[in-house]
């Protein structure tokens, strides 16, 4: 048994039919000796006597809010919340595996720039009563410090018969240094509650793995005199890393009929600007990536070529 | 050329072959995303490797105040992956593929590092730790893990060579 | 809907034996504490014995040595076995049992029977 936080505590049980359990110890948070008795919930019905209470912790049911009163005065709470571990694995009840980039990704994490600031977030068909909290750190053993927010629903959506819902929590490196070569990965620990249980899901990065930088902006066109070709110009995007002579962007800019099926003309580049070869009903479209560091594509920014 | 007594190297070369070195280690392992080398344990046979840190003043300001220390941090860390690229744990079992990029990633880091440290001029460099795996599995970890390793440290050296190309150059 | 039947409550002799059952039924989730409880004509209400969910037994004064508290959590059952039944014992006998239901799946309630009554003459 540990403490989450004042007068919650993780009971972690082995999950298995017939399993003994855990034999927990609450103390009531009083220097009273006598006449104390202690109830759960919402029940008035008392448990025991005694400045302690010791309970065979085997399942939910034996999870909840410990009291302990003294004439009809609470004293202190208890609330015991379950850790299952079966065969040997923690349960993933509460969030959904995203599946991506690779199985068992229950956080995805992204950054815009180099700043040290990252969005994290995670998918659950649960709706009520639920809580997240999101600590964070640079390395384990000698941690440094990373600030997290609060965590907050972010986005709902219907899949199917079932709701999904995403919540997000955006962090802040405390004492980020942008132009370093990181050498210890960011973690990333989530505490999730469902009514009784609880789970913890971590994630670990760094942070030039997840960076997404934003679409361009100001994609423009202009068209090139007695030519089907045509400019695009665009700038980087306001949330890319500063200055852009030392963060730098490479392009990909595509050439897309209205059909999908059409074929997409696309060219790479390091300037800001491109001229191509504008097609009836075509749009153009213009994604960035790190220069020097294959981290993700951003979306495109399109304009029709009309 | 960078020079011990503090003279400036040509920014343009060292960014364009920074540059090809960024290309050519993203090719001689470019599913790094699908792999989280960090969970494969062994930690210790890649956290000896020189990384470009905070205080070695490879930032704009940095560069901008004495780009020496930067030039020098870079230069120790491209004769480290030299040494590593030519050792046992590439040249030995499971052999590379006959058109790996790893020989021109070889050659290209000497190129980089003669560029910034002509012949007779002596900067100190790191000690390279004796890894040498037994089996060809491990060699084959090691090397991405070293590859993983690389990207990050020529992605930093690239940022540093287009930056004082743009706006350090003669 | 929960429910809490009482059963058993019958006019005995002095010295006698009687046992008490009770059975929740309904939408339950789980089963805390299940306590029988009396009251006699005039009086208040008074706890005899509670089992907790693990099953360990409570008396009151009155009801230790003679009683004993015993409860099947598979079939969501609590008994009352009355031995040595004394004039006194006379009164209405109430099962109480704290209960969380799908409304209320992490909070125990408590619930009540309505009664059997328990004559002893002398």
């Known amino acids: 048994i540990w403490e989450l936080k004042k007068d919650v505590y993780v009971v972690e049980l082995d999950w298995y039919p017939d399993a003994p359990g855990e034999m927990v110890v609450l103390t009531c948070d009083t220097p009273e000796e006598d006449g104390i008795t202690w109830t759960l919930d919402q029940s008035s019905e008392v448990l025991g006597s005694g400045k302690t209470l010791t309970i065979q912790v085997k399942e939910f049911g034996d999870a909840g809010q410990y009291t302990c009163h003294k004439g009809g005065e609470v004293l202190s709470h208890s609330l015991l919340l379950l850790h299952k571990k079966e065969d040997g694995i923690w349960s993933t009840d509460i969030l959904k595996d995203q599946k991506e980039p690779k199985n068992k990704t229950f956080l995805r994490c992204e950054a815009k720039n180099y700043s040290g600031r990252f969005t994290c977030w995670w998918l659950t068909t649960i709706s009520t009563d639920l809580t997240f909290s999101v600590k964070s750190s640079r390395g384990s053993s000698d941690p440094q410090g990373v600030t997290c927010g609060a965590a907050t629903l972010s986005a709902e959506r219907v899949r199917g018969d079932n709701k999904e819902y995403e919540y997000s929590v955006e962090c802040q490196e405390d004492s980020a240094c942008p132009a370093a070569e990181e050498s210890l990965p960011i973690e990333v620990m989530v505490d999730a509650v469902h009514k009784l249980k609880y789970e913890n899901y971590t994630s670990s990065f760094f942070i030039r793995d997840i960076i997404k930088p934003d679409p361009p902006k100001n994609l423009q066109l202009k068209p090139l005199k007695n030519s089907r070709q045509v400019e695009v110009s665009w700038e980087y995007p306001d949330t890319w890393s500063t200055p852009h002579s030392y963060f730098s962007l490479t392009f990909c800019v595509q050439v897309q009929g209205k059909s999908k099926r059409e074929k997409k003309d696309r060219v790479f580049t390091d300037k800001t600007s491109a001229t191509v070869i504008c097609r009836k009903n075509a749009s153009i479209s213009v994604r960035a990536q790190d220069r020097y560091y294959s981290s993700s594509w951003s979306e495109w920014a399109s304009v029709p070529c009309s | 050329r960078a020079v011990p007594g503090g003279s400036s190297p040509a920014w343009t070369q060292c960014q364009q072959l920074s540059q090809k070195l960024c290309t050519l280690a993203w090719s001689a392992h470019p599913l790094v995303g699908h792999m989280d080398l960090r969970e494969e344990g062994d930690e210790e046979t890649t956290n000896d490797v020189p990384h470009i840190q905070c205080g070695d003043g490879c930032d704009p300001q940095g560069l901008r105040d004495n780009s020496q220390f930067c030039l020098q941090r870079i230069h120790q860390g491209l004769i480290f992956y030299e040494k590593l690229l030519g050792s046992d744990i590439f040249t030995g079992e499971p052999s590379l593929l006959p058109d790996s990029p790893v020989g021109q990633l070889h050659a290209s880091l000497l190129g980089l590092s003669q560029l910034l440290q002509p012949e007779g001029h002596h900067w100190e460099t790191q000690q390279i730790p004796s890894l040498s795996p037994s089996q060809p599995w491990q060699r084959l970890l090691l090397r991405f893990k070293i590859l993983r390793s690389l990207q990050a440290f020529v992605a930093v050296a690239a940022r540093v060579f287009a930056h004082g190309a743009a706006t350090l150059s003669p | 809907e929960v429910q809490l039947v009482e059963s058993g409550g019958e006019l005995v002799q002095a010295g006698g034996s009687l046992r008490l059952s009770c059975a929740a039924s309904?939408?339950?989730?789980?089963?805390?504490?299940m306590a029988w409880y009396r009251q006699a004509p005039g009086k208040q209400r008074e706890r005899v014995a509670t089992?907790?969910?693990?099953?360990?037994?409570d008396y009151a004064d009155s009801a230790k040595d003679r009683f004993t508290i015993s409860r099947d959590n598979a079939k969501n059952t609590v008994s009352l076995q009355m031995n040595n039944l004394k004039p006194e014992d006379t009164a209405v006998y109430y099962c109480?049992?704290?209960?969380?239901?799908?409304?209320?799946?992490?909070?125990?309630?408590?619930?009540w029977g309505q009664g059997t009554q328990v004559t002893v003459s002398s």
């Open positions: 109480k049992a704290a209960l969380r239901t799908p409304t209320h799946d992490y909070n125990y309630y408590d619930y």
């Open positions: 309904g939408s339950i989730v789980s089963i805390s504490a």
């Open positions: 089992i907790t969910r693990g099953g360990t037994p």
